[in-house]
Amino acid sequence: ELCDDDPPEIPHATFKAMAYKEGTMLNCECKRGFRRIKSGSLYMLCTGNSSHSSWDNQCQCTSSATRNTTKQVTPQPEEQKERKTTEMQSPMQPVDQASLPGHCREPPPWENEATERIYHFVVGQMVYYQCVQGYRALHRGPAESVCKMTHGKTRWTQPQLICTGEMETSQFPGEEKPQASPEGRPESETSCLVTTTDFQIQTEMAATMETSIFTTEYQ
């Protein structure tokens, strides 16, 4: 069952699917000046059995000007929103991702792929959030969202991540100021961040997510 909506957006944060559930579709999109080859697939589909999942179909792009140049590779990892576009990022593959049953790995890139990807997620898909560069997490509640089916409708759970660009100030005179994250910077003059305890820099995300996969701002 396809999810009706996109994963929720969080201010100053981006999300990433660590693996894609079987049934996920990725549109075959080509960059400007290129088009899908005639009779080429419209999308790639994550399919599989109990022991192995993989992307069916191949995306192939050809020059819009010439008809006989068809080079093809497989697609590239990406932070995506279902039916929404985001910029491409360099391939970063978490080591534990392949072991997730019923899920496909991030597909590697194909030649002349569009700079943005469009995924169509299915019920059960989970995406993970992290503050973009220049912002830090004020609050790190569950930093993921899951597409769930309730009462015959799909909905994504609301991540409880709050990203702020506020400058830290110590709340109590004489209190040792915790170390700010390197990205912290003043953002607003109308509210002020105060820190009362040491802040845990590493985001606590499920499934031993590696923060290094967040390499691009998507918003």
Epitope: H139, G141, V194
Partner: antibody, heavy 115, light 107 residues
Framework: QVQLVQSGAEVKKPGASVKVSCKGS????????MHWVRQAPGQGLEWMGV????????IYAQKFQGRVTMTVDKSTSTAYMELSSLRSEDTAVYYC????????WGQGTTVTVSS | DIQMTQSPSSLSASVGDRVTITCRAS??????LEWYQQKPGKAPKLLVY???TLAEGVPSRFSGSGSGTDFTLTISSLQPEDFGTYYC?????????FGQGTKLEIK
């Protein structure tokens, strides 16, 4: 079920301080940040600030900076909002509200500042 | 600060009417907008979050739409229990400001 239960009404004199509590139950307290919102009689809603129930970090609206202190006690799943140097215009109902989207609210605490 | 402006400030409508309340942000807030209903002497109640997602337990006659700076809360068929004051609020950046409210009365 999710509940936010606030402390009872307070009457304070100008210049005094008030500390309002908000106890969360029915969910994992540290999963959700806690916001504080106030409403003066016959007026609209005014956001005061937010505190991370996990880390204790807080952001205050500039208007209240220097007068407000938000804290949490994870052991009792309680958030606190203390407002000092009270003046008559601080007379209001003070609410706590949970999470990014303020999906649950406390019942409100009436604070009256009067000489 | 981001200013949130609601219109109208008050309105009176009959049971069964379609009612629309609008909220305008002073800058682009994407879809980081919530709608609340408040009845006299009670705490506000979340109706819609992220501009268009209905909160759990909220009747389907309520719906939210819009993105960027212009947002709408619609009640498709007004019910007697829908009286109260409605507020929009953004969560794009601190401070999270509210609209001034729209008081809805039942004719």
């Amino acid at each position: 079920q999710v509940q936010l239960v606030q402390s009872g009404a307070e009457v304070k004199k100008p210049g005094a301080s008030v500390k309002v509590s908000c106890k969360g139950s029915g969910y994992t307290f540290t999963d959700y940040a806690m916001h504080w919102v106030r409403q003066a009689p016959g007026q609209g809603l005014e956001w005061m600030g937010v505190i991370s129930t996990y880390s204790g970090d807080a952001i205050y609206a500039q208007k209240f900076q220097g007068r407000v202190t938000m804290t949490v006690d994870k052991s009792t799943s309680t958030a606190y909002m203390e407002l000092s140097s009270l003046r008559s215009e601080d007379t209001a109902v003070y609410y706590c509200a949970r999470g990014v989207t303020f999906d649950y609210w406390g019942q409100g605490t009436t604070v009256t500042v009067s000489s | 600060d981001i200013q949130m402006t609601q219109s109208p400030s008050s309105l009176s409508a009959s049971v069964g009417d379609r009612v629309t309340i609008t909220c305008r942000a002073s800058q682009d807030i994407s879809n980081y907008l919530e709608w609340y209903q408040q009845k006299p002497g009670k705490a506000p109640k979340l109706l819609v979050y992220n501009a268009k997602t209905l909160a759990e337990g909220v009747p389907s006659r309520f719906s939210g739409s819009g993105s960027g700076t212009d947002f709408t809360l619609t009640i498709s068929s007004l019910q007697p229990e829908d009286f109260g004051t409605y507020y929009c609020q953004h969560h794009y950046d601190t401070p999270y400001t509210f609209g001034q409210g729209t008081k809805l009365e039942i004719k």
